[in-house]
């Protein structure tokens, strides 16, 4: 979390960003709030990054102002109108690519005053893992397999009967290239496998950590699958 | 000095509707949101929605979704509140204020009363 | 929606005596809350916005503090005209609500 104050002159008001990673290919969204005014004309938003000459975006008078917008975001950033009433000036950017990865500044005059925050924005590929037995082996194999991943994580399998186990020695990774030469896919083999056990398909760049369990009884599987953003700090 | 004056008391029948003005003074309607905010005798404060000219928005609590209109006229500097398929339960003290996302002036308030 | 509770619903004090209500939101709202005076028959007046901003022309015998969901409004010194129905509202997240109020009468 990143708390910005405002600048000499005006009143100074408090801003804040959290810093988050985005999905490239999907919608992202980099959060900031700001306290709000109710002289809603006075409002004024401002996205910068941090080495690009433009303006990522800007609202003024209730409404985009686009005039200076850098050309790398045109027609991808919009903020949420309906909620800049109750400070609320968060950035929802389309088509996140591996170069909007950077420093970006939410920069905010209301007239009460003025004030900015920064927020360290990553971009990568993270998806679910999914956890199946794989019937086609020789002997009892499970299969752990995510589609998108950037940059190239690691996997690591646990089990909650042989707690700290390494199983480094009965698993095998591979990563796939993507058709569109950034993003890989993740396939991770277990042998070896017994039944009445919980394992967990452990998947984890410096952007999101995932994980996918699979419990495998006589009777029954049982699958959960869990994504977590690692970088999610506020500003 | 900024003032906001409303229109008269209203009988209703239940299942009519009623519109109500709002008529705000100076540079309320190019700065900032209209609300409607009604009371039910003996009762507490409801915001039943606003109005944003200059963002050209309007959103309504969940409970009047469907039965609730705000509309502002910029070049009349008057905000409409219609209020349809009306109930008993709809007798109140309904206030106009200039604001959100919290209210500074407010309107005398118009008697809507719904009676058979 | 965010469900604003006031306690107490009555609170009987003394003129010149403090009055200390509160409000709470059954989620966070920040700082973003206001207090508002209402006198029978009247409309409703702003005393506080930001939690504990004054509004404009409200005596200094008004304040209030908190921030998450536990708010504060002190009336340092009752006025015999401070007697009446106070509400929060909190504003962090549409659609704008209310509390139940808290009556401030005369003991």
């Known amino acids: 979390l990143i708390i910005g104050f405002g600048i000499s002159g005006r009143h100074s008001i408090t801003v804040t960003t959290v810093a988050s990673a985005g999905n490239i290919g999907e919608d992202g969204i980099l959060s900031c709030t700001f306290e709000p005014d109710i002289k809603l004309s006075d409002i004024v938003i401002q996205w910068l990054k941090e080495g690009v000459i433009g303006l990522v975006h800007e609202f003024k008078e209730g409404k985009d102002e686009l005039s200076e917008q850098d050309e790398m975001f045109r027609g991808r950033t919009a903020v949420f109108a309906d909620q800049v009433i109750v400070g609320n000036a968060s950035l929802r950017l389309k088509n996140v690519q591996l170069t909007d990865a950077g420093t970006y500044k939410c920069y905010i005059i209301t007239s009460k005053g003025k004030g900015n925050a920064n927020l360290e924005y990553k971009t990568g590929a993270f998806s679910m893992p999914e956890v199946n037995v794989d019937y086609n082996a020789s002997s009892e194999t499970l299969r752990c397999e995510a589609p998108r991943w950037f940059p190239q994580p690691t996997v690591v399998w646990a089990s909650q009967v042989d707690q700290g186990a390494n199983f480094s020695e009965v698993s095998n990774t591979s990563f796939e290239l993507n058709s569109e030469n950034v993003t890989m896919k993740v396939v991770s083999v277990l042998y070896n496998v017994t039944i009445n056990n919980t394992y967990s398909c452990m998947i984890e760049n410096d952007i999101a950590k995932a994980t996918g369990d699979i419990k495998v009884t006589e009777s029954e599987i049982k699958r959960r699958s869990h994504l977590q953003l690692l970088n999610s700090k506020a500003s | 000095q900024v003032q906001v004056v409303q229109s008269g008391a209203e009988v209703k029948k239940p299942g009519s509707s009623v519109k109500v003005s709002c008529k705000a003074s100076g540079d309320t309607f190019s700065n900032y949101a209209i609300s409607w905010v009604r009371q039910a005798p003996g009762q507490g404060l409801e915001w039943m929605g606003g109005?944003?000219?200059?963002?050209?928005?309007?959103n309504y609590a969940q409970k009047f979704q469907g039965r609730v209109t705000i509309i502002a006229d910029k070049s009349t500097r008057t905000a409409y509140m219609e209020l349809s398929s009306l109930r008993s339960e709809d007798t109140a003290v309904y206030y106009c204020?200039?604001?959100?996302?919290?209210?500074?002036?407010w309107g005398q308030g118009i008697l809507v009363t719904v009676s058979s | 929606e965010i469900v604003m509770t006031q306690s107490p619903a009555t609170l009987s004090v003394s003129p010149g005596e403090r009055a200390t209500l509160s409000c709470r939101a059954s989620?966070?709202?920040?700082?973003?809350l206001a207090w508002y005076q209402q006198k029978p028959g009247q409309a409703p007046r702003l005393l506080i916005y930001g939690a504990s901003t004054r509004a404009t022309g409200i005596p200094a015998r008004f304040s209030g503090s908190g921030s998450g969901t536990e708010f504060t409004l002190t009336i340092s010194s009752l006025q015999s005209e401070d007697f009446a129905v106070y509400y929060c509202?909190?504003?962090?997240?549409?659609?704008?609500?209310f509390g139940p109020g808290t009556k401030v009468d005369i003991k």
């Open positions: 109005i944003i000219p200059i963002f050209g928005i309007t």
């Open positions: 509202q909190q504003y962090k997240k549409w659609p704008f609500t």
């Open positions: 989620q966070s709202v920040s700082s973003n």
């Open positions: 204020s200039r604001g959100g996302p919290y209210f500074d002036y």
